[in-house]
């Protein structure tokens, strides 16, 4: 599923991401834009044999199990396929674990490079939330 901007903002708010660990909703929408272009089925294979999955491009080396990444830690204890669902529950729950790890949203390079320090509230402007 490819979410609309406001549609995703509403879904993320419903799942408790607004101000989760101090990050406003706009940060999460911005991260999703630059990680996956709001596409829940986005996948990207990496040079180390791992793959990034879903709307927040969560990596199989550390966070989920796809059965083909040697030494996967599966810290979110989920199959990576769950991160491709049009229901973003699994991605949000895993994202909450990631952002709680100590480095906050810096864990998303796209957020660090494209969203951090910008007017992230623009990503939810005009949305009925």
């Amino acid at each position: 599923k490819v979410f609309g901007r406001c549609e995703l903002a509403a879904a993320m708010k419903r799942h408790g991401l607004d101000n989760y660990r101090g990050y406003s909703l706009g940060n999460w929408v911005c991260a999703a834009k630059f990680e996956s272009n709001f596409n829940t089925q986005a996948t990207n294979r990496n040079t180390d044999g791992s793959t990034d999955y879903g709307i927040l491009q969560i990596n199989s080396r550390w966070w989920c199990n796809d059965g083909r990444t040697p030494g996967s830690r599966n810290l979110c204890n989920i199959p990576c396929s769950a991160l491709l669902s049009s229901d973003i529950t699994a991605s949000v729950n895993c994202a909450k674990k990631i952002v709680s790890d100590g480095n906050g949203m810096n864990a998303w390079v796209a957020w660090r490079n494209r969203c951090k320090g910008t007017d992230v509230q623009a990503w939810i402007r005009g949305c009925r939330l």
Epitope: N46, D48, S50, Q57, W62, R73, V109
Partner: nanobody, 133 residues
């Protein structure tokens, strides 16, 4: 508390070899990246080599490609830097560093090399390498 312990420096003739070691302790998970940097007198700190600790992908500065090899022992959270064909220009204090961010998406640890260590949040004490001609 996170600590990095570097060892293995010394003096060597040009053309010789040295192996540096860096042991990381205090991590519950990670580190994600480990790397080696160096600083010669009067010069900026520069990246030498880095490795993704999960996948083992390696990155090198152009000046050391083909001569230096970075490797890992994941069980010991230790990285090594094997330096062959050393040149007087390799003389510097060598520092190991770690990026403890466990990235959500895949991150190439080599990015920090060209920026003097951007993203690397833990640094070990230096070990002196002196190469004489």
């Amino acid at each position: 508390d996170v600590q990095l312990q570097a060892s293995g420096g010394g003096s060597v003739q040009a053309g010789g070899s040295l192996r540096l070691s860096c042991a990381a302790s205090g991590y519950t998970i990670g580190p994600y990246c480990m790397g080696w940097f160096r600083q010669a007198p009067g010069k900026e700190r520069e990246g030498v080599a880095a490795i993704n600790m999960g996948g083992g992908i390696t990155y090198y500065a152009d000046s050391v490609k083909g001569r230096f090899t970075i490797s890992q022992d994941n069980a010991k959270n230790t990285v090594y830097l094997l330096m062959n064909s050393l040149e007087p220009e390799d003389t510097a204090i060598y520092y190991c560093a770690a990026d403890s961010t466990i990235y959500a998406s895949y991150y190439e640890c080599g990015h920090g090399l060209s920026t003097g260590g951007y993203g690397y949040d833990s640094w070990g004490q230096g070990t002196q390498v002196t190469v004489s001609s």
